[in-house]
Each structure stands twice: as structure tokens, then as C-alpha cells.
Interface confidence: low
């Protein structure tokens, strides 16, 4: 007799990563009994919301419902209706909105309100919107690229599938950039995490991680920029800026007012005789790094070993995946590949900076300028970081593997934190084997 | 390492400020708390000031209580004591740069007796 | 306007027993949660935060668990040395509060 297909018994789920600059929304897949199973949820849709981030709504937040409705109404046509009232939508805003939540609490809750009320629209199951914290967005991102790299797998595989996968079960840090905020979590080796807010314990698939990790806020490439600007303009004779993070010829006016709105650029608060300035890119990168340099405080330390800002870091233990803009702006540089090593990444990066901004702009029609233009500065920005605030080493840096997707999935803390809520990773490994012979029909 | 000090007997009315010395903790990375603990009583918040300089109080401590710092230390002003503010006060850091969300290292507390 | 009630104000317990303390909060707090252990005439001190965390050095028989709305502190394996107060106290929101503490559980161990 002729096989006939069998219904497909798959489950989806929502979550909406509100970040600073932009919300997106990724929609995951997973066969419905296979729930316990490690690596078989993968995304089927990323569905990026046309607009800046939900924290820019305080001001009008009338118009969050149509920000969210495209992206929402592209969820409806992907997941079939029948799925629809069992789908779980998630919402978890990060460091955009943390630094507005410490502006106001007020003006956040007001924000969150109303993104809740317009979620609760559509026919799925929504969660809730929350502002996650930064331990928590480090935490889920790691478990993401651990579950999608197959690391929390106890079975050993005689094929690899993922590029970055090695033999071994050794789960791989994450460094994960965003516009706001920086995390980095690992598994130290057979270290102490000194200080208590640094430490998570997670037992996955029946084995124990202790785990570090950390979350600078303001600290991510957006806010960074204003802090460094902030930094620079206390210094200048007048109202120009003469920036060696901008391509050689490039302008912008920047207001006074917009430079102190956020919380990050306060400690370098000061009257200025002027309400704009003008910067003018002069593209020196040993400048620019020397510059963002001056916002990593190495001085003090309480710990044995502190990354930046007396923040306890733990020696650096096996390979990191580095996602979200570290592989965005890395991977526009071109410098991605495995082989390109830290010394190379710096010469490239000498060489893009001190292309004038004309020729940049005809070498790269199709970018947004205000993208374009912030190349040179978020690139210097990610060797600063890494180097000085994480301090990766030339001989370490082979040690980074820079992660756009994983499997077809993104990586990122989306997937982790979905995995979660619906309780998808259990502490003890499944007693069933994932693939018995029942499954094949 | 956190440390109290400015408690004593005053009379109500007069006002009191109290003192949180750090030492190795940097309070522009840290928010800071004061909490106090009346006799036989239970741990109250009174409000925070954090990394960045905002401070934040109870709704029952606003214009009661004022939070300031310096490099080293943060401090308490109680504007207007009454008897009912007689308690053992704490200073706490918060755990993480600009976290809130606990309290991971509490000074040993400081007696203030406000009494006519 | 975040208030947590903390449940029940006092409890006595055997050596080797397993006590619950309750902890609920009047709005959601999501994982924002801390315990504190304080001894008469002592400083608080931390046990656990976000929930369910430990903080560095505390024995695995204290352990948390909940989210939202509802928590709990569970002590296992009583110990003489574990008779204390116990303090829950949410991290969520610092401002338009009454008070972030718990009202206290006193925990005798006999």
C-alpha cells in the first residue's frame, strides 16, 4: 500500500527581541514530541519591524499598534490558523529600555503597557512583554548557540553539523553586541566566580554549568558612540569636533540636547558654550582607539581579574560565538573568516577608516549613510572592546568565531529565552532516546 | 567594604546626617541603598541612589529623607526625626554596575535614638 | 504598588526538617527576587537573587524558586545555625514603593 503523508504534528512559537535600535520578530518551529529533544527547535521567520526601537515611543505611543502590525500580520500568514491559539508570543525588551526605565519608570511601564494591549490583539497566546535583565540576556543567548551548536547533546555524532563544532562537549561563550549593551558569558575553567551577581547555575540534559556572565549597560555600539562624543566635545576648543572615528571629509551636526538625553552620556555631563557641534572626520584608526579606550576605566579592580569598570571577568575558558553586531559590523568589514587574524582585522581596519567618506559613499551606494558612516567608529569599537574590555589577545582572537546563524537560526537570546518559558530544556537528560523506532512510519 | 557611622540620641526635629564609607567599591558603578530596621521590626526600605547619580526613595520617605554621595561615600539625611524613625540603619551596595535588583554587600549598621 | 507580603511570619522547625517561606508580590516582578538571611543583632545577608540564584558561599540547601507573582524560599536539612529572619525582597522597582522587603519570616529551629 501507498505511504500516506501524516499530518504534521509541529508546534510554533513567538518572541519579539524590542531591542534599542529596532524590534524584531522570529518565529520558531519544533515537532510537537520531540519538546525535550536538544537542537530541534530552529527558526522559520525573522520579520524585521520597520522603525527605531520601543523605547522611541515614549512620546507617541499611539503608534506602537501599527509599528508591531506588519511583522504581527506576517506571523498570522506563516503559522497556520489552526496553530494560532496554542502559539505562545513573548515580548522581552532590552537595553533601550532599560536605560528609559531609569530614566522613568514611569514612561517605561507606559510603553510596555501599551505594546501588551497591542499584542493582546492578535489570536496567539501572548506572554506578557518584559524588560528582561542584562544577566538574563546574556544567560538565554548563551544557552542559544549552545542548543543550536549541539553542545548540550550527550550523544556523540560520527558527522558535524554546525562549522564551529568541535568533538568535545566544552560549551562555547557568547558575546553578544547590541546598540545599548554588551554581554559576555562563559564557563570559566575550575574558577570561582568572585562576585555573586556574576554567577548563574543551570543544570541542562542532566549535567551542571556554572556559569559567568555579565551585561554592560551603555556600553553597547550606539550608546558608546554618544559616550565617547560626550567624552570628546568636554575637550574641544569650539564647536567642531575633529573625530578620527568618521571617514576623512565626513560631517554631521550633532545637537547639545540630543548628546545628554540618554542616561549613558551623564557622567560626562558638562555646559557647553554651544547648542550643536560639527564633527568633522579626520579617519585615524590608532586615534579612535585610542580614544574609545578612555571609556573602559582599568584602574580599578576589587576582584583578581576585572574586565572594565571593576566588573569582575574570569580568565578566558574555550571558544566564544560572537553574534548580534559584533557579526553584523564584522561581517560588512569582511572580517568574519576563521582565518583572518587580529593583526590582520587591525590593518584592514587602519585602511577603512582613512578612506574618505566620498569614496566610501560610491563604494557602498546601497547602504544608509547614517550606517555607512558609523562603520569605521562600531568596528574600532569591537577590537577595543574585545582586546582591552574582554582582553582577548592575538593569540586568542583565533578563539572568536563570528556568528551570523547557527543552522538557519539566529543567534541570539530570543531562541534561549522561548526555550525557557516553555520549558523546552530539562535538567535531566530525556529518558527516551530522540529517534526510536517508532518515528519512522 | 561598607561601613555607618553618624548614628546617635537626638531630639525630634533636629536633623541627622548619616555616613556610608566605602572602600573598594567604586560608586560610580554601583547604586547604593539605605535600609533601617526599627526595634523588633522588619527590614524597610528607605531609597536608593544610583551609578549615575539618581536617587530614588520609598513613597513614604520622600521629603523625610535625602540620599547624596561623593567618590567614597554616600550619605542620609533624615530632615525632620521623629520617634518613629528611632531603627538601626544599613547601607547596602547593589550587586552588578547599575543593577537594583539586590543587595550583596550591607555595612553593619549605624543606632539612631530619637527621642525629647 | 509592588508590596510583598511574605508568609508566615514565624515557623519552627526540627533539626534535619524542611521549611517554605512565601513570598508574594501585589504586581508581577518577573525573576527580580532576593532572599536574605538576618541573625539577631547582624547585618543581612544576601542568598539568593533572581529568583533562584545563589549568592557566593551559600550552602545548596537554601533554594528559590517561583516567578511572576509567587515565590518561595526553601530550606532543607535544617540546621541549628539556619534559625534566623528571613527577608524577601523584589528588585523590580525602586520608586512609587512602599517598602521592597518582606515582612519577614522568623524561622526557630528546635
Known amino acids: 500500500t501507498q505511504n500516506k503523508a501524516l499530518p504534521e504534528n509541529v508546534k510554533y512559537g513567538i518572541v519579539l527581541d524590542a531591542g534599542s535600535s529596532h524590534t524584531s520578530l522570529y518565529i520558531y518551529k519544533w515537532p510537537a514530541e520531540k519538546e525535550n529533544d536538544t537542537g530541534v527547535v530552529h527558526q522559520v521567520e525573522e520579520c524585521r519591524v520597520k522603525g527605531p526601537g520601543i523605547s522611541k515611543f515614549v512620546q507617541k505611543v499611539n503608534e506602537i499598534g501599527i509599528y508591531l502590525t506588519d511583522c504581527m500580520e506576517r506571523a498570522r500568514e506563516v503559522i497556520p490558523r489552526s496553530q494560532h491559539q496554542e502559539t505562545p508570543v513573548y515580548l522581552g525588551a532590552t537595553a533601550g529600555m532599560r536605560l528609559l526605565r531609569m530614566e522613568s519608570e514611569e514612561l517605561a511601564d507606559r510603553v510596555l503597557d501599551v505594546v501588551e494591549r497591542s499584542l493582546s490583539n492578535y489570536p496567539f497566546d501572548f506572554q506578557g512583554a518584559r524588560i528582561i535583565t542584562g544577566q538574563e540576556e546574556g544567560a538565554y543567548g548563551w544557552i542559544t548557540i549552545n542548543y543550536l551548536l549541539g553542545k548540550f547533546s550527550q550523544k556523540t555524532r560520527w558527522f558535524s553539523i554546525v562549522p564551529y563544532e568541535t568533538n568535545n562537549q566544552e560549551t562555547f561563550g557568547a558575546l553578544d553586541l547590541g546598540g545599548a549593551s554588551t554581554q559576555v558569558t562563559f564557563v570559566p575553567q575550575n574558577q570561582t566566580i568572585e562576585s555573586p551577581d556574576n554567577a548563574l547555575q543551570f543544570r541542562l540534559y542532566g549535567k551542571d554549568y556554572n556559569v559567568y556572565t555579565h551585561s554592560f549597560l551603555c556600553y553597547g555600539k550606539d550608546q558608546a558612540l554618544w559616550q565617547k562624543l560626550a567624552k570628546d566635545i568636554q575637550v574641544a576648543s569650539n564647536e567642531i569636533l575633529r573625530d578620527p572615528c568618521f571617514h576623512p571629509g565626513y560631517k554631521k551636526v550633532v545637537n547639545v540636547s540630543d548628546l545628554y538625553k540618554t542616561p549613558c552620556t551623564k557622567r560626562f555631563e558638562m555646559t557647553l558654550p554651544f547648542q550643536q557641534f560639527e564633527i568633522q572626520g579626520i579617519g585615524n584608526y590608532q586615534q579612535c582607539h585610542q580614544s574609545i579606550l578612555e571609556l573602559f576605566n582599568t584602574s580599578y579592580c576589587p576582584y583578581s581579574q576585572c574586565a572594565f569598570n571593576g566588573i569582575f571577568l574570569p580568565p578566558l575558558q574555550g571558544d566564544f560565538g560572537a553574534f548580534s553586531a559584533f557579526y553584523f559590523v564584522m561581517k560588512f568589514l569582511n572580517l568574519t573568516s576563521e582565518k583572518v587574524s587580529q593583526e590582520k582585522v587591525t590593518e584592514m581596519m587602519k585602511k577603512f577608516c582613512a578612506q574618505p567618506w566620498e569614496e566610501i559613499k560610491t563604494s557602498y551606494a546601497g547602504v544608509k549613510e547614517k550606517y555607512l558612516s558609523e562603520y569605521c567608529f562600531s568596528g574600532t569599537y569591537i577590537l577595543s572592546l574585545l582586546l582591552q574590555g574582554y582582553h582577548f589577545t592575538a593569540d586568542s582572537w583565533e578563539h572568536i568565531h563570528f556568528i551570523g546563524k547557527i543552522q538557519g537560526s539566529d543567534a541570539g537570546w530570543t531562541l534561549g529565552y522561548m526555550l525557557n518559558l516553555t520549558n523546552m530544556i530539562p535538567a535531566e537528560q530525556p529518558l527516551s532516546t530522540p529517534l526510536s523506532h517508532s518515528t519512522y512510519v | 567594604s561598607v561601613e555607618e557611622s553618624g548614628g546617635r540620641l537626638v531630639t525630634p526635629g533636629t536633623p541627622l546626617t548619616l555616613t556610608c564609607t566605602v572602600s573598594g567599591i567604586d560608586l560610580s558603578n554601583n547604586a547604593m541603598s539605605w535600609v533601617r530596621q526599627a526595634p523588633g521590626k522588619g527590614l524597610e526600605y528607605i531609597g536608593i541612589i544610583r551609578s549615575s547619580g539618581s536617587t530614588y526613595y520609598a513613597n513614604w520617605a520622600k521629603g523625610r529623607f535625602t540620599i547624596s554621595k561623593t567618590s567614597t561615600t554616600v550619605d542620609l539625611i533624615i530632615t525632620s526625626p521623629t520617634t518613629e524613625d528611632t531603627a538601626t540603619y544599613f547601607c547596602?551596595?547593589?550587586?552588578?554596575?547599575?543593577?537594583?535588583?539586590?543587595?550583596?554587600?550591607w555595612g553593619p549598621g549605624t543606632l539612631v535614638t530619637v527621642s525629647s | 504598588a509592588y508590596d510583598m507580603t511574605q508568609t508566615p511570619a514565624s515557623v519552627e522547625v526540627a533539626v534535619g526538617g524542611t521549611v517554605t517561606i512565601n513570598c508574594q508580590a501585589s504586581e508581577r516582578i518577573y525573576s527580580n527576587l532576593a532572599w536574605y538571611q538576618q541573625k539577631p543583632g547582624q547585618r543581612p545577608k544576601l542568598l539568593i537573587y533572581?529568583?533562584?540564584t545563589l549568592a557566593s558561599g551559600v550552602s545548596s540547601r537554601f533554594k528559590g524558586s517561583g516567578s511572576g507573582t509567587q515565590f518561595t524560599l526553601t530550606i532543607s536539612g535544617v540546621e541549628c545555625a539556619d534559625a534566623a529572619t528571613y527577608y524577601c525582597q523584589q528588585g523590580y522597582s525602586s520608586s512609587n514603593v512602599d517598602n521592597t522587603f518582606g515582612g519577614g519570616t522568623e524561622v526557630v529551629v528546635k
Open positions: 533572581y529568583t533562584s
Open positions: 547596602a551596595r547593589g550587586g552588578g554596575s547599575y543593577s537594583i535588583v539586590f543587595w550583596n554587600l
